[in-house]
Amino acid sequence: YDFTNCDFQKIEADYLRTISKDLITYMSGTKSTDFNNTVSCSNRPHCLTEIQSLTFNPTPRCASLAKEMFARKTKATLALWCPGYSETQINATQAMKKRRKRKVTTNKCLEQVSQLLGLWRRFIRTLLKKQ
């Protein structure tokens, strides 16, 4: 999906209002220095691409994020403010229903959510110095 035409201001507002709080709740008990930033993004559409990938694409060591509250709210926000996003996600959602839900929050999931927090922070940032 091409995130170029999303309403970035509305997505930013949703993130600050709810998604950020859910991410921080998920990460409670860990320090911001516990994990290195290994994923970055270079503009707002790119950030949303990476956020979608980390939130909804299961990895071998962290398969459960899509069921979390922050993921559900992320999905709703993207569906609301990115034209045509919902239609592209129908197949992905059907595939997701076939997977078993993991109840354990693994260290790898914490690491992945730490990366997500970093990506969201980059998404909402504006360069103070354009140079």
Partner: antibody, heavy 122, light 108 residues
Framework: QMQLVESGGGVVQPGRSLRLSCAAS????????MHWVRQAPGKGLEWVAV????????HYADSVKGRFTITRDNSKNTLNLQMNSLRAEDTAVYYC???????????????WGQGTMVTVSS | SYVLTQPPSVSVAPGQTARITCGGN??????VHWYQQKPGQAPVLVVY???DRPSWIPERFSGSNSGNTATLTISRGEAGDEADYYC???????????FGGGTKLTVL
């Protein structure tokens, strides 16, 4: 562990070519701008070239423009520097380094390789 | 093209504060980054975006930037701080990374 490992350095005669490579691991290579920086013996750091995260934007130092070519392969997590028409003044340790990028602004060079030595001599 | 000027050398007594300057025309409008390089080693980022510090760098390292001068401050200097220090900016006008000439810090 985040790592950059350069290779391909060596001794080469003036006017000849050399190709440097940099293998990235431990981070999502495709999301970072990548640079080459060099350091002549006993001298300071000199920036050589940058390629954007997607490969769409490329910029060179004036001293190497038209002779050096920077490329990346995001599927293999590798950065390359093709150096043609080498001169004695190109003798240096060449470092591969990464930086986060926002639009067309490249941020701090936060991870560096250990460097590979290039000697141009007849 | 944009030029960054650093003093070639700075000395500090152990336990004292060292200040390394980086001069440039209206440098305060740029984000300045600082690197430490010990002999035979690759540079290491010590301060970024004027005054932020990577998590692995001690709090003794700090930075500031305004007007025509950026400053790297190293408090409570130690022998292990002896190194070359480089300032750096990205110039959007020339599309170049620009480094200062480097400053050799000696802990007396």
């Amino acid at each position: 562990q985040m790592q950059l490992v350069e290779s391909g350095g060596g001794v080469v005669q003036p006017g000849r070519s050399l190709r440097l490579s940099c293998a990235a691991s431990g981070f999502t290579f495709r999301t970072y701008g990548m640079h080459w920086v060099r350091q002549a013996p006993g001298k300071g750091l000199e920036w050589v070239a940058v390629i954007s995260y997607s490969g769409s934007y490329i910029h060179y130092a004036d001293s190497v423009k038209g002779r050096f070519t920077i490329t990346r392969d995001n599927s293999k997590n590798t950065l390359n520097l093709q150096m043609n028409s080498l001169r004695a003044e190109d003798t240096a340790v060449y470092y591969c380094t990464r930086s986060p990028q926002w639009e067309e602004v490249y941020e701090a060079l936060d991870i560096w390789g250990q460097g590979t030595m290039v000697t141009v001599s007849s | 093209s944009y030029v960054l000027t650093q003093p070639p050398s700075v000395s500090v007594a152990p336990g004292q504060t060292a200040r390394i300057t980086c001069g440039g025309n209206n440098i305060g409008s740029f984000s300045v980054h600082w690197y430490q390089q010990k002999p035979g080693q690759a540079p290491v980022l010590v301060v970024y975006d004027d005054s932020d510090r990577p998590s692995w760098i001690p709090e003794r390292f700090s930075g500031s930037n305004s007007g025509n001068t950026a400053t790297l401050t190293i408090s409570r200097g130690e022998a292990g701080d002896e190194a070359d220090y480089y300032c750096q900016v990205w110039s959007s006008t020339s599309r170049h990374v620009v480094f200062g000439g480097g400053t050799k810090l000696t802990v007396l």
